[in-house]
Each structure stands twice: as C-alpha cells, then as structure tokens.
C-alpha cells in the first residue's frame, strides 16, 4: 500500500491556524479573520459595509478590525452612546469627573499621574536612603535596599545595635518588608495605609 506522510510536518498553516493531514495532504482550519489554503490572507472586514455604526470608520487589522467612532459614540461597533465616566476610564483608584458632554478628568490617588492615572510616579529622585542604601520605588513612597550593616526602611538602623527600639520607629511590616527586600532580593512595594 501507499506510505502515509504527515503533510503538517512542514508547518504550512499560517496565522495560528490548525493543521490536519488528510490523504497525505494538509488541510488548514483558519482562525476568524484569515482565509486561503494556508490561512495566509487577512480578511478585510472593512470590505463588508455596516460593521461600524453611527458613522464610525472601519480600520482593518490582521485577523480583525477596529471601529473608530465619531464623538459621542463608543463600543466595539460604535453602537453605544459615550458617557465620559461610565465606565470610569480612571485606573489605580482614580476618581472620574465629567467635565463636558464628551470630556472627563481623573482625580488620581497620591502616587499616580497621567490622564487616566496610569503612571506610578517614581519617588526615587527625591529619596533619602541613608548609609549607602539604594532606592526602590513604591506607591507614593520608596524603600531602601540596605548594605549588610544597616537596616530599617531608610537604612538608618545599625544592625550591630540589635533591634532595641526599632519598633519605636518602624512597624513590624516595614521591617519584614526590608528583610525580604535585602536578604531575598525581592522588590516588594510597600503600600502605606
């Protein structure tokens, strides 16, 4: 009889499609958005009218498409009315305030910035790590990675002096944070309450 050959060994199917061998020939099952014998052709969804509603512009993408909506509309198909703060675009706990029909403003929590509070402010430029400590940024704070003979959040405590009085200055979790950071090399962020 004829010898069976795995036609899929040469990976003929493109763009994440699934290959199967039928009668020594490959067959490609394409992902949505691709076509052709080897799924090598991107389907231009924008050739089909009506994908984007309310005057939205269709933008073809590899394997998919995107609607660019006119002001006042939103959603995958521009089928929803745009309400600036519903849902809130503000991240990291920021509070959204509607400033106009189509505009908003995010009031960011301390330590964050950006139009949607998307950026954690780097607190290290103003650090005060003492005694050779190296700054590690946190959320609206920073911590210090200390050389072996120093400890504490800011490397102000001499290890040789022992832990007497440390609790006067540092909460247990800050000491724990420091030990994790220095001795295990973990870059934990200390969130203050």
């Amino acid at each position: 009889g004829s010898q069976w050959t795995d036609a899929c060994l040469s990976h003929p199917c493109a763009n994440g499609s699934t290959c199967t061998t039928v009668a020594n020939q490959f067959s490609c099952k394409c992902l949505t958005g691709f076509t052709g014998q080897k799924c090598e052709t991107d389907v231009n969804e924008c050739d089909i009218p009506g994908h984007c509603q309310h005057g939205g512009t269709c933008l073809n993408l590899p394997g998919s498409y995107q609607c660019q909506c006119l002001q006042g509309f939103t959603g995958q198909y521009c089928d929803s009315l745009y309400v600036p703060c519903a849902p809130s675009p503000c991240v990291n706990g920021g509070t959204c305030r509607q400033t106009g029909d189509f505009t908003f403003e995010c009031n960011c929590l301390p330590g964050f910035e950006g139009s949607t509070c998307e950026r954690n402010i780097d607190d290290c430029p103003n650090h005060r790590c003492q005694n050779g400590g190296v700054c590690v940024d946190g959320v609206n704070t920073y911590n210090c990675r200390c050389p072996p003979q120093w400890t504490g959040q800011f490397c102000t405590e001499d290890v040789d002096e022992g832990n007497s009085g440390l609790n006067d200055i540092f909460e247990a979790q800050k000491i724990e944070w420091h030990e994790n950071l220095y001795f295990q090399g973990h870059h934990h962020h200390h969130h203050h309450h």
Epitope: P110, D123, P125, N126, H127, R128, C129, Q130, N131, G132, G133, V134, N140, T141, Y142, P147, Q153, F154, T156, D168, I169, F170, K174, H192
Partner: antibody, heavy 120, light 107 residues
Amino acid sequence: EVQLVESGGGLVQPGGSLKLSCAVSGFTFSDFYMEWVRQASGKGLEWVAAQRNKANDFSIVYSASVKDRFTISRDDSKSTLYLQMNSLKTEDTAVYYCSRDGGRLALDAWGQGTLVTVSS
Amino acid sequence: DIQMTQSPSSVSASVGDRVTITCQTSEDIYSGLAWYQQKPGKSPKLLIYGASRLQDGVPSRFSGSGSGTDYTLTISSLQPEDFATYYCQQGFKYPLTFGGGTKVEIK
C-alpha cells in the same frame, strides 16, 4: 570632632554671583549627604540644596526657588562643599548654613553660617 | 512638597513647666522627623531624630513621639537654657521642609 566652617558670604548686587565654601573635618566627607540651608533675618529655616554621598553617586537635588541659579558641588580632596550662586535676587538674602546629614534623616552637624546680602 | 504645620508659633512658660510643641505633616513621613533648637545668632542644634530618638548629649527632659503625620516634642521640665526657637523638619524626602518654628519665651 566634627566641624563645618562656611566662608564666602558678603554683599552682592541683584543679578550678581557669589561662591560659598564649607570646609569640613572630623569625618569621612564622601560618606555623608551634605546640605545647604538658609535663614532670612527673623524668619524660619529653608532648605536650599543637597548633594548625596559617594554610595549614591553624589547625586544632587535643589529647591524650586534656586534651581537653575545655584550649583552645589564638592571637592573630596579638600573636604570642601561649595554653593555657587548666580543671578542672585534680593530674596536670596539670608544666613547660609552648611550641614551634614548624619545618616539618620536628620542634620546632626551645622556650620556657624555665612551672611549673604543681595542689595543694590 | 511636604507641608509642615508647627504649633503653637510661640509659647510663654516658666522654669519647671512642661512644654509641648506639635508638628503635622501633609503626608505620611514614616517617622522621618527631626527636632532642632536654635538660639539667637546661633546655628540650629539637633535634639531628636527618627521622631523619638534622643541625639547624643541632649538632656533627657527632651522627648519626641508620633508617627504617620502627627508628631510632638515635649520638654518635661523647662530649664533657663531651654528658652529658644524650636523647629521640626521632615527627612523622608526632598525637598527637606521645616516647620515655621515655635518660640519658647519666658513668662
């Protein structure tokens, strides 16, 4: 004994320049953050500039009121801290103190101060 | 910048009195607070660092306490040499900021 001695103060016209020096002794200069703090007559203390230690690459920070006008620097071989003051304004009139950041988030040693008067 | 609100701005007291000065910061400074004493024509002198640690050579009648945003300097029994101006200062981050000062005067 830790000692800091400032010099270089004096009378200067608005827009003029002056360079303050702070000679230190009694400690390893490069191990410590060094600060300049000023005090106008009858007023409170105002931080001006800082230079971190060798472990922090001698990085520098300025107050907003002097940024781009003042320059802090140090010469480890002479154990001296400097403050170059340019484009001086009448509101820069004050006693200028050099101080050592003692490794405890506090300024544990201060110089005697040097008076800078900016007036026409 | 971290704002420092020091109060009172002045206090009249007698020798032997207990004097309390407070300092409030605009954000958590993690006990990175120092207290200084300054006499007329003299440089400031460090009294307390780390909110509660007594600097070497400072009499034990001076004490500091507090955490977060609220800090206190206490002089347990005022002595004649304690009449001066006191400043708090945060050392948590640059720019370093000082309180407005508290003048302790003789009643």
